[in-house]
């Protein structure tokens, strides 16, 4: 089983999200995204910015779902 990383904040997660950012990331700064492993204690969508930063976000936030739809369409 995959172990959760020791990353405790919303930034630079290596495996799982323990907390989520409270800020909406501007869409133009986002390059890609991935969903955290289903074995993590909390679900998470990790957005990768153009500067290479990874940010944990809450899938239940509307802007997160909107961004995912936009990136899938494009």
């Amino acid at each position: 089983t995959k172990t959760e990383s020791s990353s405790r904040g919303p930034y630079h997660p290596s495996e799982c999200c323990f907390t989520y950012t409270t800020y909406k990331i501007p869409r133009q700064r986002i390059m890609d995204y991935y969903e955290t492993n289903s074995q993590c204690s909390k679900p998470g969508i990790v957005f990768i910015t153009k500067r290479g930063h990874s940010v944990c976000t809450n899938p239940s936030d509307k802007w997160v779902q909107d961004y995912i739809k936009d990136m899938k369409e494009n």
């Epitope: 907390t19 989520y20 409270t22 909390k42 809450n58 899938p59 239940s60 936030d61 509307k62 802007w63 779902q65 995912i68 739809k69 899938k72």
Partner: antibody, heavy 121, light 106 residues
Framework: CQSVKESEGGLFKPTDTLTLTCTVS????????INWVRQAPGEGLQYIGW???????YYASWAKSRSTITRNTNENTVTLKMTSLTAADTATYFC???????????????WGQGTLVTVSS | AVVLTQTASPVSAPVGGTVTINCQAS??????LAWYQQKPGQPPKLLIY???TLASGVPSRFKGSGSGTEFTLTISDLECADAATYSC????????FGGGTEVVVK
């Protein structure tokens, strides 16, 4: 008129599998999320999981190992399946719509009346 | 997980009076807090989200305030129909609910 309605619950035995269906009317499953929440007798509300407008399902940590949420957009239904029932799963189960107008799909504006599920041998 | 602790039940006040219900989060949840009203045998009804924004159709007698870890729901000009259990919900992190606070209108 927008509404959601849960299917009938009933009496289950320990180790049984629960299947509940939420039927939505007056709105599309593509326009919001459906949450499942339960409430044990005399207790507070407990989140189980939800399915997004694009069909991705997410679960509370306690529920994810034995819960599955799916949807049928043709029939406007969302199904909750929960395996390995125990007496602790005795509760009223609600489905509720989150339209995202609050900025978050966990905030739910339309609730079903709920259906009672009793687990007993 | 975030734990929400609410004012102990019951809280009582006369018709026309004011009640205040507190909800304390175990860690900061910014303003990601909602309040629901629930009457026996009925589903919850959304009152407030974003800690202070009234949901559609909710009278202005209901007022939410707070941010971070301390939140308050104030009901003024109490009516008999306000007798119910009120629950807070955090939607920043884990989607947890408080245990509920029963309001009795005398």
């Amino acid at each position: 008129c927008q509404s959601v309605k849960e299917s009938e619950g009933g009496l289950f035995k320990p180790t049984d599998t629960l299947t509940l269906t939420c039927t939505v009317s007056g709105f599309s499953l593509y326009s919001g999320a459906i949450n499942w929440v339960r409430q044990a007798p005399g207790e507070g509300l407990q989140y189980i999981g939800w399915i997004s407008d694009v069909g991705s399902a997410y679960y509370a940590s306690w529920a994810k190992s034995r819960s599955t949420i799916t949807r049928n957009t043709n029939e406007n239904t969302v199904t909750l399946k929960m395996t390995s029932l125990t007496a602790a799963d005795t509760a009223t189960y609600f489905c509720a719509r989150g339209d995202g107008s609050s900025g978050n799909y966990w905030v739910t504006d339309i609730w079903g009346q709920g259906t009672l599920v009793t687990v007993s041998s | 997980a975030v734990v929400l602790t609410q004012t102990a039940s019951p809280v009582s006040a006369p018709v026309g009076g004011t009640v205040t219900i507190n909800c304390q989060a175990s860690e900061s949840i910014s303003s990601r807090l909602a309040w629901y009203q629930q009457k026996p045998g009925q589903p919850p009804k959304l009152l407030i989200y974003g800690a202070s924004t009234l949901a559609s159709g909710v009278p202005s007698r209901f007022k939410g305030s707070g941010s971070g870890t301390e939140f308050t729901l104030t009901i003024s000009d109490l009516e008999c129909a306000d007798a119910a259990t009120y629950s807070c919900q955090e939607y920043l992190s884990d989607n947890t609910f408080g245990g509920g606070t029963e309001v009795v209108v005398k």
